[in-house]
């Protein structure tokens, strides 16, 4: 495998890790997609200092990250523990909410415009952020 | 100059297989998803797959799902396409393509033809 | 999948000619399109990304609008060079797809 150790053109660089913020939107796992195809992922929020960084980066926009719990519980994308770990939701949230009327509930964390988070109808186009660290080894998967 | 340069393609018997190869010079492989886009005789693009810089990531269009694998060796600036149990459907001049996560094929190679036929 | 639906699939015109071709995608896309030109026996080349961003060294008279699920090629003023097959192609989602194409020739 290589090891990234700088950031990719566009990308910020901040304490060992890269951040790509989207200006378009689109659904969260066509965003998912496109971090993976990025050799990255949604971001993952795991300290009020990353969230603090984030939240400067995006503005008053919403904004997806890297949690779901569209298979039952909370998961981050990268296995980050959900329970122990950092979390900002608003009050009364995540309400997993049907009234929107469009099916289902509500199964993917968003950034709102004050920073805290919402669960939200993963179809919804919003802007997201990618997120890959750096020094980590990329793993190359052996030819068949 | 970019520079990608397909080859192994040919006639094959239908379920049978074959490897497609795609050579590449003149940018910074290993960072660069790339893809693969067909196109039949007469018809219009279908793009097939797409792989990630690492490798790490890879997508497919429904119809070769199971049966297609993209991979690359970035050591060697190359990309792969597998394909098994070929159909008459699969025929088609294969691209390969230097892509990005925005899906933007910004250059291409010059093709080859796959013929899968009795 | 998303399809995307070329109109018209053929135009004849003359150079000097402004040439409109239309894309619609079955379900919103923002502007997550790309316009290619293929010549015949040669592989496409990227002219327009995201909506209406025109790739380097296209030429001005190339200009790419729309949004959501309704977008437009347009060739201001038609040059021999021009004449080819225009195809658009959605990035908003697995599968990747393009539209059945529109063939610009010479009347």
């Known amino acids: 495998g290589s090891e990234r150790t700088c950031c990719p053109v566009n990308w910020v660089e901040h304490e060992r890790s890269c951040y790509w913020f989207s200006r378009s939107g689109k659904a969260w796992a066509d965003a998912d997609n496109y971090c993976r195809l990025e050799d990255a992922h949604l971001v993952v929020v795991t300290s009020w200092e990353e969230q603090k960084f984030v939240q400067h980066h995006i503005g008053p926009v919403n904004t997806w990250m890297g949690l779901h719990d569209q298979n039952g519980p909370w998961k981050w994308v990268d296995g980050t523990d959900y329970e122990t770990g950092f979390k900002n939701w608003r009050p009364e949230q995540p309400d997993d909410w049907y009234g929107h009327g469009l099916g289902g509930g509500e199964d993917c964390a968003h950034f709102t415009d004050d920073g805290r988070w919402n669960d939200d109808v993963c179809q919804r186009p919003y802007r997201w952020v990618c997120e890959t660290e750096l020094d980590k080894a990329s793993q190359e998967p052996p030819l068949l | 100059e970019v520079q990608l340069l397909e080859s192994g393609g040919g006639l094959v018997q239908p379920g049978g297989s074959l490897r497609l190869s795609c050579a590449a010079s003149?940018?910074?492989?290993?960072?660069?998803?790339m893809s693969w886009v067909r196109q039949a005789p007469g018809k219009g693009l279908e793009w097939v797959s797409v792989?990630?810089?690492?490798?790490?990531?890879?997508f497919y269009t429904d119809s070769v799902k199971g049966r297609f694998t993209i991979s690359r060796d970035n050591s060697k600036n190359t990309l792969y396409l597998q394909m098994n149990s070929l159909r008459a459907e699969d025929t088609a001049v294969y691209y390969c393509?230097?892509?990005?996560?925005?899906?933007?094929?910004?250059?291409w190679g010059q093709g080859t033809l796959v013929t899968v036929s009795s | 999948a998303i399809q995307m639906t070329q109109s018209p699939s053929s135009v004849s015109a003359s150079v000097g000619d402004r040439v409109t071709i239309t894309c619609r995608a079955s379900?919103?896309?923002?502007?997550?399109l790309a316009w290619y030109q293929q010549k015949p026996g040669k592989a496409p080349n990227l002219m327009i990304h995201?909506?209406?961003s025109l790739q380097g060294g296209v030429p001005s008279r190339f200009s790419g609008s729309g949004s959501g699920t309704d977008f437009t090629l347009t060739i201001s003023s038609l040059q021999p060079e021009d004449f080819a097959t225009y195809y658009c192609?959605?990035?908003?989602?697995?599968?990747?797809?393009f539209g059945q194409g529109t063939k610009v020739e010479i009347k």
């Open positions: 393509a230097k892509s990005n996560s925005s899906g933007w094929f910004d250059y």
């Open positions: 995201a909506a209406f």
């Open positions: 003149g940018f910074t492989f290993r960072s660069s998803a």
């Open positions: 192609q959605q990035t908003n989602s697995f599968p990747w797809t």
């Open positions: 792989i990630s810089g690492s490798g790490g990531s890879t």
């Open positions: 379900q919103g896309i923002s502007n997550w």
